[in-house]
Amino acid sequence: EPPTACREKQYLINSQCCSLCQPGQKLVSDCTEFTETECLPCGESEFLDTWNRETHCHQHKYCDPNLGLRVQQKGTSETDTICTCEEGWHCTSEACESCVLHRSCSPGFGVKQIATGVSDTICEPCPVGFFSNVSSAFEKCHPWTSCETKDLVVQQAGTNKTDVVCGPQDRLR
């Protein structure tokens, strides 16, 4: 594709190439044969993040606390506000428009990856030799107690939800 009649950071209007407004500024009036493009900075709580010919700046995103949101990064005239979720919550989408509570891993499951502001808890089933007896968003699967190292014997086998029960050695032997 050949280049267009106007260069990068220019736009074609009424048979002439006008300069685009830089990020953080909006278009007030197009250039003419005798005048340059007129641009104005975006107002407080507004932004434009590209070279543009927009006549209105975009409003910064509002991080609504009622939806569990808080400001992760304050917007500037050139960038939008970035929202994240309050502690214990995570975004429902990439745009982070609302939050949901982190899920807990049920008994028999442990936390493989702790949730962040943008991703939910990842659970995994406790493999043989490990257990989890609580519903938790933080607890990993714990290894069964090793009765041998305590000079004890297994009195009750462990499951994925319960630890083994150790007891004293049988003295009659």
Partner: antibody, heavy 116, light 107 residues
Framework: QVQLVQSGAEVKKPGASVKVSCKAS????????IEWVRQAPGQGLEWIGV????????NYNEKFKGRVTLTADKSISTAYMELSRLRSDDTAVYFC?????????WGQGTLVTVSS | DIQMTQSPSSLSASVGDRVTITCRAS??????LNWYQQKPGKAVKLLIS???RLHSGVPSRFSGSGSGTDYTLTISSLQPEDFATYFC?????????FGQGTKVEIK
């Protein structure tokens, strides 16, 4: 004063190509766009395309894409419009015009007749 | 493409008359509207650019107004040399498009 002088009338057969020239004087050739327009007999004006003589960038009317080529030679301040695969309905007067807040100055026009 | 509807397509007037030609765009063209005069065998002339800016050398009896989609060319007092065809053209969005023309004839 600004002047755009176009090449003379052409008669072409269907399927042939035509190349019309437009020599500019009286201003900085690379400082303004050159627009191309045509007018079929008794009809209105139809935009063909625009070229930036400074570096050769172009925009074409989709209707003519693939058939039209706009070029410019800075050394002789001349723009060219070549139209290929001519049809009888391409019979028209072809104009070049200098840009800058509208089509500020026009050439006298070049009559292209397509006839078998 | 933006359609430009010009009216009337022709009109008869006398020297000294006030003449008005209108041009309607199929969408907002943000004042990027130009007017041209065409006479047989002569180069086309730009009269007014960007709705109301008189091109250099154009008599002040020509004026333009309008906004959004509706634009007007006015000749306040028609002179013998004004009998010609007038075209409007939008320069807001490619492809540039023209009105079909208004022929001003002697009554």
């Amino acid at each position: 004063q600004v002047q755009l002088v176009q090449s003379g009338a052409e008669v072409k057969k269907p399927g042939a190509s035509v190349k019309v020239s437009c020599k500019a004087s009286g201003y900085g050739f690379t400082n303004y766009l050159i627009e191309w327009v045509r007018q079929a007999p008794g009809q209105g004006l139809e935009w063909i395309g625009v070229i930036n003589p400074g570096y050769g960038g172009v925009n074409y009317n989709e209707k003519f894409k693939g058939r039209v080529t706009l070029t410019a030679d800075k050394s002789i301040s001349t723009a060219y419009m070549e139209l290929s695969r001519l049809r009888s309905d391409d019979t028209a007067v072809y104009f070049c015009a200098r840009g800058g807040s509208g089509f500020a100055f026009w050439g006298q026009g070049t009559l292209v007749t397509v006839s078998s | 493409d933006i359609q430009m509807t010009q009216s009337p397509s022709s009109l008869s007037a006398s020297v000294g008359d006030r003449v008005t030609i209108t041009c309607r765009a199929s969408q907002d063209i943000s004042n990027h509207l130009n007017w041209y005069q065409q006479k047989p065998g002569k180069a086309v002339k730009l009269l007014i650019s960007s709705t109301s800016r008189l091109h250099s050398g154009v008599p002040s009896r020509f004026s333009g107004s309008g906004s959004g989609t509706d634009y007007t060319l006015t000749i306040s007092s028609l002179q013998p040399e004004d009998f010609a065809t007038y075209f409007c053209q939008q320069g807001n969005t490619l492809p540039w498009t023209f009105g079909q023309g208004t022929k001003v004839e002697i009554k």
